[in-house]
């Protein structure tokens, strides 16, 4: 019988509040054997896929999605989902990315590195994703 797939987790490095023009990396985690990780933006209509998967621990794999230079348009809700044959997982909770004007001061506090919890993470709608893996990469509008 098919195994129950654990929900993926999502976090952001260095945090969820990012100065304009800085970089951010979303980190999705799931079990070993994930073939495709997908980062979804706001809704399922905009997403990026990767098959560049590596070990996060003996029992976990992870994928990273990097935005080199954050723009105001990158602000919003993000979540992860993964494909482990023969099916897709549920979505992770939402993570909200906030983009702030660069203050230029070195003392302006950002969200803690690796933060994925707290008020910026929202529950997903837990609806199931039935569409097939995007084996040819982007099948929708680019995230970034």
């Amino acid at each position: 019988q098919e195994e129950d797939l654990p929900r993926p987790s999502i976090s952001a490095e260095p945090g969820t509040v990012i100065p304009l023009g800085s970089h951010v990396t979303f980190v999705c985690r799931g079990p070993v054997g994930v073939q495709t990780f997908r980062l979804e933006r706001d809704s399922r209509s905009t997403y990026n896929d990767t098959e560049d998967v590596s070990q996060a621990s003996p029992s976990e794999s992870e994928a990273r999605f990097r935005i080199d230079s954050v723009r105001e348009g990158n602000a919003g809700l993000y979540r992860c989902i993964y494909y482990k044959p023969p099916k897709w997982s549920e979505q992770s909770d939402y993570l909200e990315l906030l983009v702030k004007e660069s203050s230029g001061g070195p003392d302006s506090p950002d969200t803690e590195p690796g933060s994925s919890a707290g008020p910026t993470q929202r529950p997903s709608d837990n609806s199931h994703n039935e569409h097939a893996p995007a084996s040819q990469g982007l099948k929708a509008e680019h995230l970034y």
Epitope: V32, G33, S54, Q55, P58, R64, F65
Partner: antibody
Framework: EVQLVETGGGLVQPKGSLKLSCAAS????????MNWVRQAPGKGLEWVAR??????????FYADSVKDRFTISRDDSQSMLYLQMNNLKTDDTAMYYC??????????WGQGTPVTVSA | DIQMTQSPASQSASLGESVTITCLAS??????LGWYRQKPGKSPQLLIY???SLADGVPSRFSGSGSGTKFSFKISSLQAEDFVIYYC?????????FGSGTKLEIK
């Protein structure tokens, strides 16, 4: 259909150089980590090098036996993988395979290109 | 580096029999283990990934089990094309190491 076609192998003298190429098709090259694996005549498999995607800053990893002599690189715009091999030794004689990662595992292999290092 | 100890180095069996190959990792690798087969003069082929998952298009007579440091690979009801060389590989940390191989021979 996934295809990985290696070229560039041949006969080279010790301390010489060679550049292997791998043309990829049938999949979205830029979302996959890629590897080179080699197999000496009559021997087992030896992982040589790995390169990750732009999301992972094109990070590279090497076997100790080739570190500082071999360089793995990729051209996502052309769906090409490369292995620049310098200061070659007789121990580097092997069949060299281009390998596509999937789920972190070696899911697709090219047919290989032979490299012979001999005086 | 993680060493992968594969056994036996060779094994004889008859058509229709079952065989089991073992791979031991020198440190825990969770389920970051793959099994490959290589036919003479051909490229290796992934059979099992994540220790237990069957790769695309691979017949169900192949199976994998184990986690941590001890792994097994089983072929039930051997067919003529199964008498080739099999390798395990850990993908937990670089260098990504292979076992030394098991040659399956027809009895």
């Amino acid at each position: 259909e996934v295809q990985l076609v290696e070229t560039g192998g041949g006969l080279v003298q010790p301390k010489g150089s060679l550049k292997l190429s791998c043309a990829a098709s049938g999949f979205t090259f830029n979302i996959n980590a890629m590897n080179w694996v080699r197999q000496a005549p009559g021997k087992g498999l030896e992982w040589v090098a790995r390169i990750r995607t732009k999301n992972n800053n094109y990070a590279t990893f090497y076997a100790d036996s080739v570190k500082d002599r071999f360089t793995i690189s990729r051209d996502d715009s052309q769906s090409m993988l490369y292995l620049q091999m310098n200061n070659l030794k007789t121990d580097d004689t092997a069949m060299y395979y281009c390998v596509r990662d999937r789920a972190g595992f070696f899911a697709y292999w090219g047919q290989g290109t032979p490299v012979t290092v001999s005086a | 580096d993680i060493q992968m100890t594969q056994s036996p180095a060779s094994q004889s069996a008859s058509l229709g029999e079952s065989v089991t190959i073992t791979c031991l990792a020198s440190q825990t690798i969770g389920t970051w283990l793959g099994w490959y087969r290589q036919k003479p003069g051909k490229s290796p082929q992934l059979l099992i990934y994540a220790a237990t998952s069957l790769a695309d298009g691979v017949p169900s007579r192949f199976s994998g089990s184990g986690s941590g440091t001890k792994f097994s690979f089983k072929i039930s009801s051997l067919q003529a094309e199964d008498f080739v060389i099999y390798y395990c590989q850990q993908l937990y940390s670089t260098p990504l190491t292979f076992g030394s191989g098991t040659k399956l021979e027809i009895k």
